[in-house]
Structure formats: C-alpha cells, structure tokens
C-alpha cells in the first residue's frame, strides 16, 4: 500500500522571500528504492486553474521547472518527498501536488501554500498646517500581505495604567499596492497636547496575519509635547 | 551562529545502553538531517546513521542495525543516539554533525563530540 | 559498501610547500552529474571540519589554498601552500550510497 501525507490542516502559510519546504511524506509497506520511484510536484495558481509542472524526479535524474526547486534525494530515501522551493514569491501562491509513483501504485496529495509578508511600522509627526497645541501623529504600515491588515491607536496613562483603545479622531487611509504586489497603509491620530496628561503613552497598534503577536510602536507625550520611540516590538510570521 | 551540544561522558558496563544528546541552536533545525559518526581510540570515522527531523525519517549503517536508534526532539531542537547491548568495542568517541541535504550531502557543523567508554 | 582508499597515509611537508592526496573510491560516487564526494580535516583533540563539498566547492571560511578536484572515482585534495595550522588528519567521505564511508585518513605533519 502506497500513501502520501500532506501538511495537516492542507495549508502551508510561509513568509515571503522564504526558503519553503512544502512536506510531502511517503508511507510505503516496504523499504522505499529511490532509483524505482517518481516524484512529481506540480502547482496551480490562485488567479489562473492551470496546472503547471514545478519538479520532477525518477531514478537517476531530477529536473526544475521553476528555478531552485528540488526534493532531497537523501531525504526521499526515508520517506520524505518535500520540495524545497528557495525565496518563495508572492505569485508562487496556490495549490501544490505531490505525485508518488512507486510502479505500478501511484499515490498523491494537495496542499495549499499562502505566502505571507510582514508589515514594517513607523510613527510620524507632521504639525504642517496643524493649530497650535494640535499634532497630527501618522503610522505607516509597509509591506504586507495579505491587504487585510488591523490598525487601532492605544493610550495608557498613569491614572489608568492598562491601554484604553481610541476611537475619535483617528482617520486610516486606504491601502495601497506596491509594485511587488505588497501594501502599505497610513493611520492618523489627531491629538489636543493642552487636552492630554503629560506622560501619556500613545501605541499605534498592528494586526496582521503574518504576526504573532500585534506590532506595536509608540510615543509619549511630554511637557514639551511629544516624545517618539522607536517600533518597540517586531515579531514577524517564521 | 550554528552550535551542536553534545551530552557529557558515558561510562558504561557490556550489555549496557547509552543515550547521547545533541542539542542544536542558530538554525531551523528541520532543515537539515543530523548525522551521526564515531570515532574509536586511534581509528578512522564511521558512519553510524541520520534522521530527517522533518519526519523522523531515519537510515542506519547496517552494522548498527538494530542496535541503534536515532531520535529527535522538534520542540527542543535535540537530537538522540541511543546504542543498546554494547560491547567494548564500542568504546568511542560519538559525534552528531548537521548534514545539508538539499544542495548535496555533507555535514557542516559537528559537536564536540561524547567520549562513551565500555568497560567492565 | 563503497570503499575509499586515500594515498598516502602519512605525509610531511614544509611551510609554504605545496601538499597532495588522493582518494580513490571502489566504485563512481557520480550521481545525475555531480559528485558526492566530501573532504574533512580533523584537527589534533577536535571535531572533523568540513573543507571542501561536491568534489571541488570550498565550503565557507576555508582558505582558498585548499582546492578539489576529480569526478567517478578518482578525487584529489591539493592544499597550495600549507601552513602550520593545517595539521591534522584529513578525511574523504562520499555520500552518493549508504552507508556512507570514509577513506582511512592521511595524516599531515610539518617538516
């Protein structure tokens, strides 16, 4: 008896520009001979239902379609017929087939790749044709994917220590493409200093499904205004 | 920066069973197999075996055959040697050693090795 | 089992000479047009390191003096210029067949 065992869950999420392994394991009654095997993988695109072949191994040959890609002849002797596919592509997305022929069973599996990039955060002040004692706090999120992406504004203040979402005068942009297919949105915070506690802390938060955890970055505001820190964490998707 | 971190020093009586760990850091520890070679006093290197962390896929020397079995922790990037019934000619140092497998096959990163002594 | 016989076992060379050896295995360690042949150095009281992958790349951070060459079943370590520090024993190893096996070492001395 032949069979092929995908990824559980039959989606792979692996960051952009990543060396993915996308598994395959083979489960044969006998010890596996690689020189009296195939392995093809084959991937079909989100936009477009064609399937188009990516690797190919038999006996004593292995061909690339898509460059970089191979499956590990000493990995295949144990049962393990996963493609490595080296700095993996937003466009590389979709379904990917194991096909396992072990003359004459032939056995397969489907796996769907979703491949993921992480947004950069930055905070920003920008006073131009703002009143007095009125700031306009920006944070810009660049270079992610998917576009859904969740930006909310935060403050923690020495009266309630724990963070308080905002909600008024916070206006976020629309998301716009970059040309390598990734998006960047800006979220604005409008803020009264006269209105604020100095030592307020002010987050700009980001949800997106290639973190963890939320990036966050934030500022406190100072008898003289306003103090920006530095993004303080970065946990992106690995 | 990749580190393999051997198990101390075993000293074990015949017909004993000895477990070597290697505890790997500064890579993704399913991307690569983990050999593992010996050395007896004096003598060359020995191929006893790797694992496939990625499916705990494992091939043995045939001598060892039934004697050894490799093992690996993914959760704790620790891989294991275990060798039952052993003999004095065992006596040896045992070195796990990160082996590429995609671009060729080799091992680019070796532990310090673990001196397991057989004596009565 | 793939036997890989290295020539000489012993060899004693002045700084700044150049150094040869040979490996020669019982059968071709060629597969799909590469060569799975390994070279290692293993220094007195350490662990073997990894010199040269594939017959002939230099694997990262070994000086160049050290070069591969060969394919089937005839391969070659040459060193250019050998330094103190390149004292040790040195081991081939193919990995095209298992169990994988090693040649039986050269050992390197400075004259």
């Known amino acids: 008896d032949l069979k092929v065992e995908m990824m559980a869950g039959g989606t792979q999420i692996t960051p952009l520009n990543d060396n993915v392994t996308i598994f395959c394991n083979i489960f044969y009654s006998q010890p596996l001979n690689i020189t009296s095997m195939g392995i093809t993988w084959f991937w079909k695109s989100l936009t477009f239902d064609k399937e188009v072949k990516v690797f190919e191994f038999f006996g004593d040959h292995q061909e690339a379609f898509r460059p970089g890609a191979i499956v590990s002849p000493w990995r295949l002797k144990s049962g393990d017929a996963s493609l490595r596919l080296p700095g993996i592509q937003l466009e590389e997305a979709g379904e990917y087939r194991c096909e396992v022929v072990v003359t004459p069973l032939k056995a397969q599996g489907t796996v769907q790749l979703e491949v993921v990039a992480s947004p950069a955060s930055r905070l920003l002040l920008d006073q131009v044709g703002m009143k007095e004692n009125e700031d306009k706090y920006m944070c810009e999120s660049s270079g992610f994917y998917p576009e859904a992406i969740n930006i909310t504004w935060e403050k923690q203040t020495q009266k309630f220590p724990h963070p308080i979402e905002i909600s008024e005068d916070v206006i976020t942009g629309p998301t716009i493409k970059n040309m390598d297919g990734t998006f960047n949105v800006t979220s604005c915070l409008k803020l009264n200093s006269s209105q604020e506690d100095p030592g307020t802390v002010y987050q700009c938060v980001v949800r997106h499904a290639s973190l963890h955890t939320p990036l966050r970055s934030n500022f406190t505001l100072t008898a003289a205004r306003h103090s920006l820190s530095e993004t303080e964490k970065t946990d992106n998707f690995s | 920066e990749v580190q393999l971190v051997q198990s101390g020093a075993e000293v074990k009586k015949p017909g004993a069973s000895v477990k070597v760990s290697c505890k790997a850091s500064?890579?993704?520890?399913?991307?690569?197999?983990m050999d593992w070679v010996r050395q007896a006093p004096g003598q060359g290197l020995e191929w006893i075996g790797d694992?496939?962390?990625?499916?705990?896929?494992?091939l043995y020397n045939q001598k060892f055959r039934g004697r050894v079995t490799l093992t690996v922790d993914t959760s704790i990037s620790t891989a294991y040697m275990e060798l039952s019934r052993l003999r004095s000619d065992d006596t040896a140092v045992y070195y796990c050693?990160?082996?590429?497998?995609?671009?060729?096959?080799?091992?680019?990163?070796w532990g310090q090795g673990t001196t397991v002594t057989v004596s009565s | 089992d793939i036997v890989l016989t290295q020539t000489p076992l012993s060899l004693s060379v002045t700084p700044g000479q150049p150094a040869s050896i040979s490996c020669k295995a019982s059968?071709?360690?060629?597969?799909?047009?590469?060569?799975?042949m390994n070279w290692y150095l293993q220094k007195p009281g350490q662990p073997p390191q990894l010199l040269i992958y594939?017959?002939?790349t230099l694997h990262s951070g070994i000086p160049d003096r050290f070069s591969g060459s060969g394919s089937g079943t005839d391969f070659t370590l040459k060193i250019s210029r050998v330094e103190a520090e390149d004292v040790g024993v040195y081991y081939c190893?193919?990995?095209?067949?298992?169990?994988?096996?090693f040649g039986q070492g050269t050992k390197l001395e400075i004259k």
């Open positions: 050693a990160r082996s590429e497998v995609f671009y060729g096959n080799y091992a680019d990163y």
């Open positions: 500064g890579y993704t520890f399913t991307d690569y197999n």
């Open positions: 694992i496939n962390p990625n499916n705990g896929g494992t």
């Open positions: 059968q071709s360690v060629d597969y799909d047009g590469d060569s799975y």
């Open positions: 594939a017959a002939s």
């Open positions: 190893q193919q990995s095209k067949e298992d169990p994988r096996t």
